[in-house]
Amino acid sequence: RKIPKVGHTFFQKPESCPPVPGGSMKLDIGIINENQRVSMSRNIESRSTSPWNYTVTWDPNRYPSEVVQAQCRNLGCINAQGKEDISMNSVPIQQETLVVRRKHQGCSVSFQLEKVLVTVGCTCVTPVIHHVQ
Amino acid sequence: RKIPKVGHTFFQKPESCPPVPGGSMKLDIGIINENQRVSMSRNIESRSTSPWNYTVTWDPNRYPSEVVQAQCRNLGCINAQGKEDISMNSVPIQQETLVVRRKHQGCSVSFQLEKVLVTVGCTCVTPVIHHVQ
């Protein structure tokens, strides 16, 4: 799913207030809901009919430093007999997410939001059949 | 997939530098890769063997204001005949993502990162058959 553009309003103060100095704003330290849990430790990536592998990318100047990307293992889907059925397609499910980019020059540290496209997993679909002649 | 905890290092200045005043830091306005596009296959949520619907939640004090959540339509998966196969299960694929929370009191505006658990879509799995009681 796509994150809409920021526009010119969200990060600005109300019109009646003095503008933000130097094109930056105050970001409080700490993360809300940091201890929220994902119950995904069930290796669905191997048991899906459209199985996928994970690749981890690492960047120490990004938060989170670790971003995990899924890659569908097959073009087709896996049937009940464990064979690939090429009449169906394994397709990636993608999600735009935000990360924080750290930029520093000496003791001057600033941060900026960055949009990252993450493939979260795969799903099995019926292909759209249309002939291009 | 799970976002690791912030710890006490990412948002801090190097040890040799003076600490961040007032528990906040500078966030530059603008978003890197804002124009990046999602290239998801067309209406995969309806063509998947584990189809899903979308619900949009809206919060003007969150960026992005619009967060889309998927809900699997069925418990079972849809077979080639368009019937539900209850020997297979449609399960949600979840992803932790970051959003920005806006907090304001008069002309004082600050921002804080927040973790949100998003169901991105659904996939069809073969469950492990055994009772955990």
């Epitope: - | 699997c72 339509r73 069925n74 418990l75 469950p127 058959i129 009772h131 955990v132």
Partner: antibody, heavy 123, light 107 residues
């Protein structure tokens, strides 16, 4: 231990609706499906449908589509089954029953049952 | 849909005897998707066997399940007084159906 406690017996007139509740305890409500089974006098058990509180997924027996509506209130760990346009043939005991989690057990593996709610439809 | 037919309809035995209950499917059912339940008057059904042959937690080992394809059997090796009840088989390999039940009564 797992417990499913259902609401009390109901007597309804034909054409009315009834909503039966099933309060779960002893496990994480969101992580398991909840099913409903009908037992009419002298008839075999009949699976009505099931719901996944986590994903929102719902599946119905074709015979109960349009008749039964399954919902959950995750904050209250409670599942509901509503029957509409009641007729005399809806007179039965209705059970809620816990299904699997879809990961380690199939959603349709029923293990624990509520005590049953008797619904009587009579003019 | 798959129809499950249980036999006999009623089985009269004495405590200490062996009980053999049959469940026949109108078409093949994967063993993974066949279960047996016990129901006593005024009570909810109780899971005995899942996956055709695996005993549920807390079920005594005198209960055993077997079979594959279209023919499944529940065996109670030595009947105890508390075993007299109605027994149902159930499948969900295709749709979701129960047998009509076998009543096990004291002779």
């Amino acid at each position: 231990q797992v417990q499913l406690v259902q609401s009390g017996a109901e007597v309804k007139k034909p054409g009315a609706s009834v909503k039966v509740s099933c309060k779960a305890s002893g496990y994480t409500f969101n992580e398991y499906t909840m099913h409903w089974v009908k037992q009419a006098p002298g008839q075999r058990l009949e699976w009505m449908g099931g719901i996944n509180p986590n994903s929102g997924g719902v599946s119905y027996n074709q015979n109960f589509k349009g008749k039964a509506t399954l919902t959950v209130d995750t904050s209250a760990s409670t599942a509901y089954m509503e029957l509409s346009s009641l007729r005399s043939e809806d007179t039965a005991v209705y059970y809620c029953a816990r299904g699997g989690d879809g990961y380690y057990t199939n959603y349709f593996d029923i293990d624990y049952w509520g005590q049953g709610t008797t619904v009587t439809v009579s003019s | 849909e798959i129809v499950l037919t249980q036999s006999p309809g009623t089985l009269s035995l004495s405590p200490g005897e062996r009980a053999t209950l049959s469940c026949r499917a109108s078409q093949s059912v994967s063993s993974s998707y066949l279960a047996w339940y016990q129901q006593k008057p005024g009570q909810a059904p109780r899971l005995l066997i899942y996956g055709a042959s695996s005993r549920a937690t807390g079920i005594p080992d005198r209960f055993s399940g077997s079979g594959s394809g279209t023919d499944f059997t529940l065996t109670i090796s030595r009947l105890e007084p508390e075993d007299f009840a109605v027994y149902y088989c159930q499948q969900y390999g295709s749709s979701y159906t129960f047998g009509q039940g076998t009543k096990l009564e004291i002779k």
